[in-house]
C-alpha cells in the first residue's frame, strides 16, 4: 500500500503564438481545481474508462478575476498535494490523466457551473520511494507544470511497496533468510504469508493472506488451469471450474428459481437448490421462521419464532419485497440526461442514449456541428443531437441556402404594404399611419403619437426598416 502524490506547479498559457483567452472575467469570476486519474500499466484507455489505480480531486483554488486588457497569466492554484492512495502493489508503469476544471462563480441557477479547461494524459515508469519526477504537458494553448512521486505507507517498502518491514526482534541481526530493510536498516523484512494452500507455482501474493493467480490459472488457490480447448463444444463445462465463457441459451437463463434459489441444469430441464425455509420446484413454497434466514440482501428479520407465526423482513436501502428480494426502481429518479433511456440492471444503472449523445449518463453532447457548414454567413448551433443553422439576415432554411422573404410574416401594421429590400424590408404605410412598421397613428391635426416622425419624412412616406 502507498500513496501517489501530485504537485501542480503552474497552469497558464504555453509558449508560442495564440495565447488562450483568460478563463475568467470581471463579469464571471472563477477558480480552478484539478482532477487526477491513475490506471495501471501503459494503457491507452479512453478518459472515461475507470481509474483502476485511483483518483483524486484538489481543493478549489483562489477566486480569479481577469484584469481587462492583460494577457492571461499563470492562474492561481489550489494549495496542497493531490494524493491518490493505492491499496495493492505499485505497478511501476502507469497512465495518468490530469484535468483542469474551471468553476464559474456567477449567480447561475442551481449553483456553480463547471467546465473542463484542459486535459493532459501520459504514460510513465516510476518506482515507489524514488525522488519527485518533474513534467510539463501541453493541452492546446495551455501548459501544465507538475511533479509526482509514489511512496509506500509503512510497513510496506520497496519499488512496488510489496515488501513489509517490521522492527528488529534482536538488536544485532535479522532472522534467518530475512534481510535488513533499506533504507530503514534498523528494521527487518517480514516474510509474506500467502493464503494457506495457495499454489507456490501458479499463485502469488502482495498482501498477507491473499492468493493471486498467474495468467492461465484460476480458482481460490490458483490450482485450476484456465482451459480454452474444453470451451469448443456448444455448451462446454461451467465457467466456475474452467474459466470458460458459456455461450448459448440454457434452462437456467434468467434464473427460474425464486427466493434466492440457485439453478443447475439437468439432462432434461433444471433443478433449484433452495435456501433454508423454501421448497418446491422453484423454491416458491415457504414454511419459514427467522431462524431460517428468509430475508435477502441484508434484510433484518423480525417475529416468526415458529412456522405458524409470520415474520417480517425490514429491508436495507435499495431493496424491497416480502423477502427483500426486489430492487427499488432507481430509474424513477431519471438519472439519464438528454432523453436517455434508463435501465436498472441490478448491479448497475445503464443509460441508452439518444442519437447525438454519449457517456454513462448521456452527458456528452457529440459535436453536432463537426463537418457541417452553414451557407451565406450562417453559424452552426449545437443542441439536442441535431445541428441547426442560425442564418444571416435575408437567408433561411436548414443550411441558410434559401433566400428568406422578409415580408412573409406580414410585418407592416395597419394595412401597410411590405417591400423586400437588400438590407431587410420596407413598409409603405396606409394613410394615417407612420413608423418603420406603420405602427404609429398620425393624429388629424398632423401631430403624431409618440415617437415623433424623423425629420425629413412625411407620414405617408415609405419607412426603411434596417
Amino acid at each position: 500500500a502507498g500513496v501517489f502524490e501530485l504537485q501542480i506547479h503552474s497552469f497558464g498559457p504555453g509558449p508560442g503564438p495564440g495565447a488562450p483567452r483568460s478563463p475568467c472575467s470581471a463579469r464571471l469570476p472563477c477558480r480552478l481545481f484539478f482532477r487526477v486519474c491513475l490506471k495501471p500499466g501503459l494503457s491507452e484507455e479512453a478518459a472515461e474508462s475507470p481509474c483502476a489505480l485511483g483518483a483524486a480531486l484538489s481543493a478549489r483554488g483562489p477566486v480569479y478575476t481577469e484584469q481587462p486588457g492583460a494577457p492571461a497569466p499563470d492562474l492561481p492554484l489550489p494549495d496542497g498535494l493531490l494524493q491518490v492512495p493505492f491499496r495493492d502493489a505499485w505497478p511501476g508503469t502507469f497512465s495518468f490523466i490530469i484535468e483542469t476544471w474551471r468553476e464559474e462563480l456567477g449567480d447561475q441557477i442551481g449553483g456553480p457551473a463547471w467546465s473542463l479547461l484542459a486535459r493532459v494524459a501520459g504514460r510513465r515508469r516510476l518506482a515507489a520511494g524514488g525522488p519527485w519526477a518533474r513534467d510539463i504537458q501541453r493541452a492546446g494553448a495551455w501548459e501544465l507544470r507538475f511533479s509526482y512521486r509514489a511512496r509506500c505507507e509503512p510497513p510496506a517498502v520497496g519499488t512496488a511497496c510489496t515488501r513489509l518491514c517490521r522492527p528488529r526482534s534482536a538488536p544485532s541481526r535479522c532472522g534467518p533468510g530475512l534481510r535488513p530493510c533499506a533504507p530503514l536498516e534498523d528494521e527487518c523484512e517480514a516474510p509474506l504469508v500467502c493464503r494457506a494452500g495457495c499454489s507456490p507455482e501458479h499463485g502469488f501474493c502482495e498482501q498477507p493472506g491473499e492468493c493471486r493467480c498467474l495468467e492461465g490459472w484460476t480458482g481460490p488457490l490458483c490450482t485450476v488451469p484456465v482451459s480454452t480447448s474444453s470451451c469448443l463444444s456448444p455448451r462446454g463445462p461451467s465457467s466456475a471450474t474452467t474459466g470458460c465463457l458459456v455461450p448459448g441459451p440454457g434452462p437456467c437463463d434468467g434464473n427460474p428459481c425464486a427466493n434466492g434459489g440457485s439453478c443447475s441444469e439437468t439432462p432434461r430441464s433444471f433443478e433449484c437448490t433452495c435456501p433454508r425455509g423454501f421448497y418446491g420446484l422453484r423454491c416458491e413454497v415457504s414454511g419459514v421462521t427467522c431462524a431460517d434466514g428468509p430475508c435477502f440482501n441484508g434484510g433484518l428479520c423480525v417475529g416468526g419464532a415458529d412456522p405458524d407465526s409470520a415474520y417480517i423482513c425490514h429491508c436495507p436501502p435499495g431493496f424491497q419485497g416480502s423477502n427483500c428480494e426486489k430492487r427499488v426502481d432507481r430509474c424513477s429518479l431519471q438519472p439519464c440526461r438528454n432523453g436517455g433511456l434508463c435501465l436498472d440492471l441490478g448491479h448497475a444503472l445503464r443509460c441508452r442514449c439518444r442519437a447525438g449523445f454519449a457517456g454513462p449518463r448521456c452527458e456528452h453532447d457529440l459535436d453536432d456541428c463537426a463537418g457541417r457548414a452553414c451557407a451565406n454567413g450562417g453559424t452552426c448551433v449545437e443542441g439536442g443531437g441535431a445541428h441547426r443553422c442560425s442564418c444571416a439576415l435575408g437567408f433561411g432554411g436548414r443550411d441558410c441556402r434559401e433566400r428568406a422573404d422578409p415580408c412573409a410574416a406580414r410585418p407592416c401594421a395597419h394595412g401597410g404594404r411590405c417591400y423586400a429590400h437588400f438590407s431587410g424590408l420596407v413598409c409603405a404605410c396606409a394613410p394615417g399611419y407612420m413608423g418603420a412598421r406603420c405602427e404609429f397613428p398620425v393624429h388629424p391635426d398632423g401631430a403624431s403619437a409618440l415617437p415623433a416622425a424623423p425629420p425629413g419624412l412625411r407620414p405617408g412616406d415609405p419607412q426603411r426598416y434596417l
Epitope: 478518459a47 475507470p50 481509474c51 442551481g110 436501502p317 435499495g318 432507481r330
Partner: nanobody, 120 residues
C-alpha cells in the same frame, strides 16, 4: 466510498410541517441526480421528489403543492420541505443519489432512512 446522511424526521400532527436534510460526502466528483424516496409498511418504495439528471425537479402526484425539494450544491445537500402533512405520508424516507465518483464511474447510493410519523 460515499455516505448519505439524512436528518429531520420525527413525529408530527396532521397539517404540520417537517424539513428533511440529506448530506452527501465522500469520493464525490459531482452529483448527477438526487432525491427522496419513501416506503410505508407493506408498500413498495416510491419516489417522492428529486432532481433528475437533467437538473429538473420531479414530484410524485400525491405530494405536488405540499412538498418542495431544494438543494445546496456547495454542501452536496438536498432538502425536502414537507407541509400539510397527512396520515398517509407516514413512512421511512430514504435519500438517494446517483453520483459521479472521482474515478469517473457512476454509482447509485441510498441513505439509511429517517422515519416520518403523522398522527393526531
Amino acid at each position: 466510498e460515499v455516505q448519505l446522511v439524512e436528518s429531520g424526521g420525527g413525529e408530527v400532527q396532521p397539517g404540520g410541517s417537517l424539513r428533511l436534510s440529506c448530506a452527501a460526502s465522500g469520493s464525490i466528483f459531482s452529483i448527477n441526480a438526487m432525491g427522496w424516496y419513501r416506503q410505508a409498511p407493506g408498500k413498495q418504495r416510491e419516489l417522492v421528489a428529486g432532481f433528475t439528471g437533467d437538473g429538473s425537479t420531479k414530484y410524485a402526484e400525491s405530494v405536488k403543492g405540499r412538498f418542495t425539494i431544494s438543494r445546496d450544491n456547495a454542501k452536496n445537500t438536498v432538502y425536502l420541505q414537507m407541509s400539510s402533512l397527512r396520515a398517509e405520508d407516514t413512512a421511512v424516507y430514504y435519500c438517494a443519489a446517483d453520483v459521479q465518483l472521482l474515478t469517473s464511474d457512476y454509482e447509485f447510493y441510498w441513505g439509511q432512512g429517517t422515519l416520518v410519523t403523522v398522527k393526531p
